[in-house]
């Protein structure tokens, strides 16, 4: 028996479903009665999901994985891992046994995508050339953590004073708050990319200071 | 008629290393899984070790893992399994089984290994 | 790990006699459980395999019943060459393959 998964990771939206493919090639006249399955957390090799004697043994992992009961028969022992949390990343093992034994393991690659930016200035008043303000951009949610990009009006980085904090959640989500500290010219605009790195997501915010009013 | 012969057991120091080998005839070897099973002397029978037919993919007992490597040569139906660092817990009859399903249909005599300072 | 249990450690019994053979396993194993003899001195020998389904060779006096956590191997009459240690083995989790400790049949 040869078992075949995806050689890429599964990327997977959290609180969605994902689908782990684990694919064998049952021998002609093959009955489930002849199939042991077992799917564990390839580190850790915690039981995930298992099938044996010809029943689904059921969820091991927090009764939300389930088989594909009419596809089994045809070789697929795909994994359904339904409302997809943070913990859940990492690498899964397929275990495909009928006489001889197999198996493969596929990673699982969980994803959020950031906010909207928003955009605060300190101070946010009295404002002139030449001063030094301090300019918040702040993205909430996502997963895994951010890239953070700041570039002035002409498109050019701004790398320099550059602070940026990312802050996870009780849900393993990340806030990132990234404060830039400019000198301010006659006027400008200052914009802020929070990118994510699995999504390849861009989130942009910015601010354009003119005098006054300030324009966000 | 199916054959288990395996060899390569004697006696080492601990923390040395020995490589046992199975001789297989008789079955269709690429396709069945193949197994150790150890057997300490007065005592009860241990799983060491399995590999898939293709040699793919190897299973290990917590007890060896990381010490033992076990592997499969097809063009000559030979099972092998290398111990280094080996202890005096690991003196022991090695026996090479066929595996159907999980459970071991053919079982060789064994080879001896002791490991004694 | 799946846990398994022989009782008793011994069983002396006289030829013809009917003999008893326990097996427990410490959480559900369903019907995936093996067993085997071994005579001194020999390798072990495959008798029954799925709890009750005897191995290619084996006489009809050997069988094995139950399900789930308890396990028995009847031997119905004993013969001179059934006095061996018999040992099960789970493989209901077949990545950490168990076997029991054993139960000897000696000779009264």
């Known amino acids: 028996v040869e078992v075949q998964v995806s050689e890429d990771p599964v990327v997977a939206l959290v609180d969605t479903d994902a689908t782990l493919r684990c694919s064998f090639s049952p021998e002609p006249g093959f009955s489930l009665a002849q199939l042991n399955l077992i799917w564990q957390l390839t580190d850790t090799k915690q039981l995930v999901h298992s099938f044996t004697e010809g029943r689904d043994q059921g969820s091991a992992y927090s009764n939300r994985t389930a088989l594909f009961p009419d596809l089994l028969v045809q070789g697929n022992a795909s994994l359904r891992l339904q409302r997809v949390r943070v913990t859940d990343e990492g690498s899964y093992t397929c275990f495909v046994s009928i006489q001889d034994f197999d198996s493969a393991a596929v990673s699982l690659q969980v994803a959020a995508p950031y906010s909207k930016p928003s955009m605060t200035l300190e101070p946010n008043k009295d404002l002139r050339p030449g001063n030094m303000v301090t300019i918040t951009c702040s993205s909430y949610q996502g997963y895994p953590e951010a890239e953070v990009f700041w570039k002035d009006g002409q498109g050019v980085p701004l790398t320099g004073n550059v602070t940026t904090s990312q802050m996870a959640n009780e849900r393993g989500l990340f806030d990132v708050h990234s404060v830039l500290r400019v000198v301010l010219g006659a006027n400008g605009t200052y914009s802020c990319l929070v990118r994510n790195p699995v999504l390849q997501q861009d989130a942009h915010g910015s601010v354009t200071i003119t005098g006054q009013p300030l324009t966000f | 008629d199916v054959q288990l012969v395996e060899s390569g057991g004697g006696v080492v120091r601990p923390g040395e290393s020995l490589r046992l080998s199975c001789a297989a005839s008789?079955?269709?070897?690429?396709?069945?899984?193949m197994s150790w099973v150890r057997q300490a002397p007065g005592e009860g029978l241990e799983w060491v070790s399995s590999?898939?037919?293709?040699?793919?993919?190897?299973l290990y007992a917590d007890s060896v893992k990381g010490r033992f490597t076990i592997s499969r040569d097809s063009s000559n139906n030979s099972l092998y399994l290398q111990m280094n660092s080996l202890r005096a817990e690991d003196t022991a009859v090695y026996y090479c089984?066929?595996?159907?399903?999980?459970?071991?249909?053919?079982w060789g005599l064994g080879t001896l290994v002791t490991v004694s300072s | 790990e799946i846990v398994l249990t022989q009782s008793p450690g011994t069983l002396t019994l006289s030829p013809g006699e009917r003999a008893t053979l326990s097996c427990r396993a410490s959480r559900s194993i369903l019907t995936s459980l093996a067993w085997y003899q071994q005579r001194p001195g020999q390798a072990p020998r495959l008798l029954i395999y799925?709890?009750?389904s005897r191995a290619t060779g084996i006489p009809d006096r050997f069988s094995g019943s139950g399900s789930g956590t308890e396990f028995t191997l009847t031997i119905s009459s004993l013969q001179s060459e059934d006095f061996a240690v018999y040992y099960c083995?789970?493989?209901?989790?077949?990545?950490?393959?168990?076997f029991g400790g054993g139960t000897k049949v000696e000779i009264k």
């Open positions: 008789g079955f269709t070897f690429s396709s069945y899984a």
């Open positions: 089984a066929k595996a159907r399903n999980n459970f071991f249909d053919y």
């Open positions: 083995q789970q493989y209901y989790d077949w990545l950490t393959i168990t």
């Open positions: 799925g709890a009750n």
């Open positions: 590999i898939s037919g293709s040699g793919g993919s190897t």
